[in-house]
């Protein structure tokens, strides 16, 4: 699987999950989140050659088409597969609230 | 929705479904499919700016990150959303067989 265990410990050139730290204030302009100040969101990057973690029958076909037509702009793309939530603390007035923001952290990628 | 109805009738620059015809023999090297000789597979293409058909909370965050960091390689990607099957005819010797190949045609796209 193209997950953090594999991707973070390898020098994989093809589609894989990459490290990305997002600072809520600096990178998103969000001031409402009190904790954490930022988080390891990660992102997906890398080419999707034939047979590289292809998502559907269509992505197999498209990767194969791309192999036969290397100049074509039609190609599968490396996108998130498994996402995890992020617990955050924000304030309503002086009252802290805990919330789970769903689908915030990329754990693995796929070619779609 | 970024579907064929909207995308094929517009000059949309952002993520949208685009027309692509695939010839089974020429583009894939498949000789075993008798009918059709090829099909309109379509593909997804175009940038994914903030709020453009974003798939998850993560893709919203990433698009926003990208807006704040325009040079970053981390950005959502335009990928298939709705896929449809393709009925095909292949031969087992002289005997024709009908099969549905699932997830073969792109009907709409999303930013993931």
């Amino acid at each position: 699987a193209l997950d953090t265990n594999y991707c973070f410990s390898s020098t994989e050139k093809n589609c894989c999950v990459r490290q990305l730290y997002i600072d809520f204030r600096k990178d998103l302009g969000w001031k409402w989140i009190h904790e954490p100040k930022g988080y390891h969101a990660n992102f997906c990057l890398g080419p999707c050659p034939y047979i590289w973690s292809l998502d559907t029958q269509y992505s197999k076909v498209l990767a194969l088409y791309n192999q036969h037509n290397p100049g074509a702009s039609a190609a599968p793309c490396c996108v998130p597969q498994a996402l995890e939530p992020l617990p955050i603390v924000y304030y309503v007035g002086r009252k802290p609230k805990v919330e789970q923001l769903s689908n915030m952290i990329v754990r693995s990628c796929k070619c779609s | 929705a970024l579907d064929t109805n909207y995308c094929f009738s517009s000059t949309e620059k952002n993520c949208c479904v685009r027309q692509l015809y695939i010839d089974f023999r020429k583009d894939l090297g498949w000789k075993w499919i008798h009918e059709p000789k090829g099909y309109h597979a379509n593909f997804c293409l175009g940038p994914c700016p903030y709020i453009w058909s974003l798939d998850t909370q993560y893709s919203k965050v990433l698009a926003l990150y990208n807006q704040h960091n325009p040079g970053a390689s981390a950005a959502p990607c335009c990928v298939p959303q709705a896929l449809e099957p393709l009925p095909i005819v292949y031969y087992v010797g002289r005997k024709p067989k009908v099969e549905q190949l699932s997830n073969m045609i792109v009907r709409s796209c999303k930013c993931s």
Epitope: Y50 | L28, G29, K31, Y90, E99
Partner: antibody, heavy 120, light 108 residues
Amino acid sequence: EVQLVQSAAEVKKPGASVKVSCKTSGYIFISNVISWVRQAPGQGLEWMGGVIPIVDIANYAQRFKGRVTITADESTSTTYMELSSLRSEDTAVYYCASTLGLVLDAMDYWGQGTLVTVSS
Amino acid sequence: ETVLTQSPGTLSLSPGERATLSCRASQSLGSSYLAWYQQKPGQAPRLLIYGASSRAPGVPARFSGSGSGTDFTLTISSLEPEDFAVYYCQQYADSPITFGQGTKLEIK
């Protein structure tokens, strides 16, 4: 270069199952149909079935139906032939071969063969 | 299933001679569903002819195939020492694919 590389020889007891693998070069796996043929010692050739790896559509010879399963693993470009309820008459060299492109077709590239011996 | 009968069972000839191998099908195969293979001891079969008469890539011109319907022939115009082997015909018109029992071509 086109190559089909098969797994090593196996010795099995009657009633057991055997799974023979056939690793192919990517292009063959993507575009062709893989057939399995066996040859008992000193005997002729017998077709067991075949698979279209890309879509996992399999076709079997009637006499092996229910006993043979042919599958494909795209991540490794490998095709597998599993034969169950083995009996002594299943002792043979098992070959994988790529067809010229159709489901039933002539076979242009062959693996080196895997000897399966069924003996108590 | 389609039964293929090859004749003769064994053919004894000398290098330089012409070899004619026959394959008869129990039902019509049309004109393009027959192949011929060569097999040497301890080796996998090698495709010689497909579609009854088309030579596979890399196969010498001395090998030729002919026939349609139920009667097919493999001809080796002038035998070379490396041609002595077992030859099989194969039909792929109908499932299951079937092979002939083989013709052994031996040096006289």
